[in-house]
């Protein structure tokens, strides 16, 4: 019997050496970066992760498929240390890396492991599909990657407490974008009984025209959503510590001069 052929998609396939990268990142995170998580079993995490989507049609993945993974990997983020981001991933990651105490989603174990990787399975094989995976334009919203990020984004937000931060891109026409993961999942998953304040850091490209984005209609929309959920909203244009990181690349820019 000839094996059935794989479904063909237009998107990039599973990242080469996926399992090795997954295990390697898991070990780096649990043994070096966060040794308090050294008891996590990376092999078990990998097999539970794969169990969510291997041997399944990659357009029919559900949130429930990832439930065993979320149950297996528990990680507590301290209150006041959660940083969301929207269209500002690179700067947010630079900030948490240097600052050392705050967490973006990609500073959690599952986020760290999966960041920038691609994966999918196929009903005809128990292996991963290294030929092609669904592209976002293929009318396949319930694919393994999208569902994974929605699930762990929601959990990350649900677990947040105290004062939470979000870094937004002030150089965009809509720094707060309704259809982003932050705008559609995370802000609505914050528990008003645990989170009392959301603070937006609206960062502008250092070379771009700087505007008072905090008073824009886009940020007003976020403010109203946050207030409707009974939380305090605050907004800072070009949060200074993050601005300093931008200045490392462009130290001569006028906004990088320290007032002496």
């Amino acid at each position: 019997l000839r094996p059935r052929s794989l479904l063909v998609w237009t998107g990039e396939p599973t990242t080469k050496h996926f399992s090795d990268i997954f295990l390697g990142r898991c070990l780096i995170y649990t043994q070096i970066l966060r040794p308090e998580m050294r008891d996590q079993n990376c092999q078990e995490i990998l097999s539970t992760f794969k169990g969510a989507f291997v041997s399944k049609n990659p357009c029919n993945i559900t949130r429930e498929d990832y439930a065993p993974l979320v149950k297996l990997v528990t990680q507590t983020i301290p209150c006041n240390k959660t940083l969301f981001w929207s269209k500002s991933k690179h700067l947010a990651h630079q900030y948490t890396w240097i600052q050392g105490k705050m967490f973006t989603l990609e500073d959690t174990l599952l986020g760290y492991i999966a960041d920038d990787l691609r994966w999918c399975g196929d009903p005809s094989t128990s292996d991963m599909n290294y030929v092609s995976c669904p592209h976002w334009s293929e009318n396949c919203p319930n694919n393994p990657i999208t569902v994974f990020w929605k699930v762990i984004s929601q959990k990350f937000a649900e677990d947040a407490c105290g004062v939470v931060q979000v870094m937004l891109n002030g150089s965009l026409r809509e720094p707060f974008y309704k259809n982003s993961t932050f705008g559609s999942v995370e802000v609505f998953s914050l528990d008003p009984n645990k989170v009392h304040k959301l603070q937006a850091w609206v960062m502008h490209d250092i070379e771009g025209a700087s505007s008072n984005a905090c008073s824009s209609s886009s940020l007003n929309e976020l403010k109203m959503i946050v207030q409707k959920r009974n939380m305090i909203f605050a907004c800072v244009d070009n949060y200074r510590p993050a601005r300093f990181l931008q200045c490392v690349k462009n130290p001569e820019h006028p906004s990088c001069r320290l007032n002496t």
Epitope: K178, G183, F188, N193, I225, Q227, K228, R229, N230
Partner: antibody, heavy 121, light 108 residues
Framework: EVQLLESGGGFVQPGGSLRLSCAAS????????MNWVRQAPGKGLEWVSS?????????WYADSVKGRFTISRDNSRNTLYLQMNSLRAEDTAIYYC?????????????WGQGTTVTVSS | EIVLTQSPGTLSLSPGERATLNCRAS??????LAWYQQKPGQAPRLLIY???NRATGIPDRFSGSGSGTDFSLTISRLEPEDFAVYYC??????????FGGGTKVEIK
Amino acid sequence: EVQLLESGGGFVQPGGSLRLSCAASGFTFTNYVMNWVRQAPGKGLEWVSSISISGGRYTWYADSVKGRFTISRDNSRNTLYLQMNSLRAEDTAIYYCAREMNTYSFPMDVWGQGTTVTVSS
Amino acid sequence: EIVLTQSPGTLSLSPGERATLNCRASQNVRSDLAWYQQKPGQAPRLLIYDASNRATGIPDRFSGSGSGTDFSLTISRLEPEDFAVYYCQQYYDWPPYTFGGGTKVEIK
């Protein structure tokens, strides 16, 4: 069954006060933004006021009622209130309480049957 | 504040006919628009939200379309119980939420 039931309407003279109540049942009241919307006789709908979920820290009002009306909620009683002071003839209307959808978008998906307020000398 | 203008004011049609109601916003409201039905002596009932999503329990003869400033509500085949007043409402820029003036669909 999800239900909203208004009460407290009646006849009042200009300058007088009334307190409307809206009893909620069949859903977790504390999780929803609540609104008051009114409809003058033979006219269209006019939004009056909104209150945030949970403790109701934030409130919003139409310009026409700002400073005269106060919205509040008692989550222990699953009840929404509208305290109306300094009433005017133009406040005469049916007052509906309405629940906002608990989603990203904010249409009003559950309405009470309304209570009538008449302001006249 | 955003002004919503509904047209026509009154629509006279027979059961079984198709009804198209329009709502125009004075500025862009994206897809943040709802449609309500109100019968005499009753509270409004949500039909459509986010411009094109049918609310729970609403028959599929009701459909909404549009985005930005121009929206429409279509009733593909009018049933006797569909004769009522219809309101659009925007929730993009608030406070205040604003409603259109209404379109009355009456029996011809």
